[in-house]
Amino acid sequence: FNISGCSTKKLLWAYSTRSEEEFILFCDLPEPQKSHFCHRSQLSPTQVPDHLPFTDSKDLPDVQWYRQPSNGDPLEDIRKSYPHIIQDKCTLRFLTPGVNNTGSYICRPKMIKSPYDVACCVKMILEVKPQSNASCENSASHKQDLLLGSTGSISCPSLSCQSDAQSPEVTWYKNGKLLSMTRSNRIVVDEVYIYHQGTYVCDYTQSDTASSWTVRAVVQVRTIVGDTKLKPDILDPVESTLEVELGKPLTISCKARFGFERVFNPVMKWYIKDADLEWEVSVPEAKSIKSTLKDEIIERNIILEKVTQRDLRRTFVCFVQNSIGNTTQSVQLKEKRGSGGLNDIFEAQKIEWHETVRFQSHHHHHH
């Protein structure tokens, strides 16, 4: 086909000789053509719709990629001749750097359904060269990691040695989709979630007297986990006193948040303090009530069959521990004013004689 009508874009890949890095070309078909083949969200906000009608397609066919040999030979089908280049929907992925990737790459829809479609193509002139050794030592890596739950940033490798003030306007893409919220050489992430992982592309324009080039770099971002630096946090009980009715059953719940630990051995137990005595209570097994990649919330209840007068003189303590340290929360029971009659009080006193049976000591839970 005649490629003279294709829109043209010049790209520069300055690769680091010290690292393995990838490169990506997007098939930037004009609007509305592109929307039929790629995600609309890939388009830059400055693109103006082209009014040529373009055949609609319900099954969103892929685009076809070609490489134009420099000697004027016919176009080569990428898939047949270049095993290190992977074609995926509207992107072309170069798995290995090298000046041999320099050349012209053409993309167009696979399915040509109208006379207008013939001119629907993009020619990308790619120049590939090794980064000069004069480049700064601490340039950002093409593989960057973000710690889950913390703050972090993703830096554009080709601009990481420049201050934010001197940095040109940058266009960012994540997994092929335009990120319109930032034009800086760094994406700041307030809190890292798993969805922040992916393939990021940063583009900026470099101009000389003769022409203008888009300098592009690709960053693989992983979200990583690490052991918490915090002791567990008791979420419940919040109050140190609890109003109760004598003679009635009572359940006190202890809920605690444990931060991520690669080797997870949470301890959660209830014990009772009575004057100078202190003993651990046999209570139902702890259970995980919410688990995320960042933390886990565990609950364990203490159950009193009937609240007695003696219980009002005791302190109920929830104890939680991880490898960093422990946290406790004490609860004192307080009789509800105006609650219960004489029968309840007699019943509660009767139970006091048997209450030692309720508490067996030493029970550990390991999650």
């Epitope: 890596s141 990691d145 710690l147 889950l148 913390s150 798993i194 992982q197 992983r222 979200t223 990583i224 986990v225 690490g226 052991d227 630096k229 630990e261 690669r262 080797v263 990649l293 490898s323 960093i324």
Partner: antibody
Framework: QVQLQESGPGLVKPSETLSLTCTVS????????WSWIRQPPGKGLEWIGY???????NYNPSLKSRVTISVDTSKNQFSLKLSSVTAADTAVYYC??????????????????WGQGTTVTVSS | AIQLTQSPSSLSASVGDRVTITCRAS??????LAWYQQKPGKAPKFLIY???SLESGVPSRFSGSGSGTDFTLTISSLQPEDFATYYC?????????FGQGTRLEIK
């Protein structure tokens, strides 16, 4: 790019303590786990233990009583001490970055960057 | 400790051959398995994680499969630089353990 370099004596006497240091360059020690692995001559790989940059450790039970791994974030270094060594501790000792990667609803761990290894011989 | 048994212990093959190495765990480890390549006098190099995911920069001729107790590493078309020793590693439970290795030699 992150690079690791092991350093320490190549010869240790039996019953003494083997001490090695791994220096991390081209990146931060923060946010990662750091492991020690060894390989006796002509044999396979044996994991010794890891430390998280904040200081939490986990050791191979077969060596636990003799191993201490520590970290110095200010120097971007972590260290291995193995006490009461015998000839069976003769090996190439590697340090590695041991990263926990979050994926969907789980994690996987990989040793994605390794030092070039240092040979330690235990002999009198 | 979970034991990983690799088979074969060694094999000879030619450039262009398709090669499969297996790794069997003594108990289920889900997909918590990685593969490493080690050349003589060098440190191991990480190839595959989570049983089947290829590390970026690793040639696509390498692939991994399996979950539970049985895993395989396949090299679809051997290249001269692929002759090395391959190790599987589990991180499902502690201690972390490695297979005994499979030595891949030129026929």
């Amino acid at each position: 790019q992150v690079q690791l370099q092991e350093s320490g004596p190549g010869l240790v006497k039996p019953s003494e303590t083997l001490s090695l240091t791994c220096t991390v360059s081209g990146g931060s020690i923060n946010n990662y786990y750091w492991s020690w692995i060894r390989q006796p001559p002509g044999k396979g790989l044996e994991w010794i233990g890891y430390i998280f940059y904040s200081g939490t450790t986990n050791y191979n039970p077969s060596l636990k009583s003799r191993v201490t791994i520590s970290v110095d974030t200010s120097k971007n270094q972590f260290s291995l001490k193995l006490s009461s060594v015998t000839a069976a501790d003769t090996a190439v000792y590697y340090c590695a970055r041991d990263v926990g990667i979050a994926a969907r609803n789980s994690y996987y761990y990989v040793m994605d960057v390794w030092g070039q290894g240092t040979t330690v011989t235990v002999s009198s | 400790a979970i034991q990983l048994t690799q088979s074969p212990s060694s094999l000879s093959a030619s450039v262009g051959d398709r090669v499969t190495i297996t790794c069997r765990a003594s108990q289920g480890i889900s997909s918590a398995l990685a593969w490493y390549q080690q050349k003589p006098g060098k440190a191991p190099k990480f190839l595959i994680y989570e049983g089947s995911s290829l590390e970026s920069g690793v040639p696509s001729r390498f692939s991994g499969s399996g979950s539970g107790t049985d895993f395989t590493l396949t090299i679809s078309s051997l290249q001269p630089e692929d002759f090395a020793t391959y190790y599987c590693q589990q991180f499902n439970s502690y201690p972390i353990t490695f297979g005994q290795g499979t030595r891949l030699e030129i026929k």
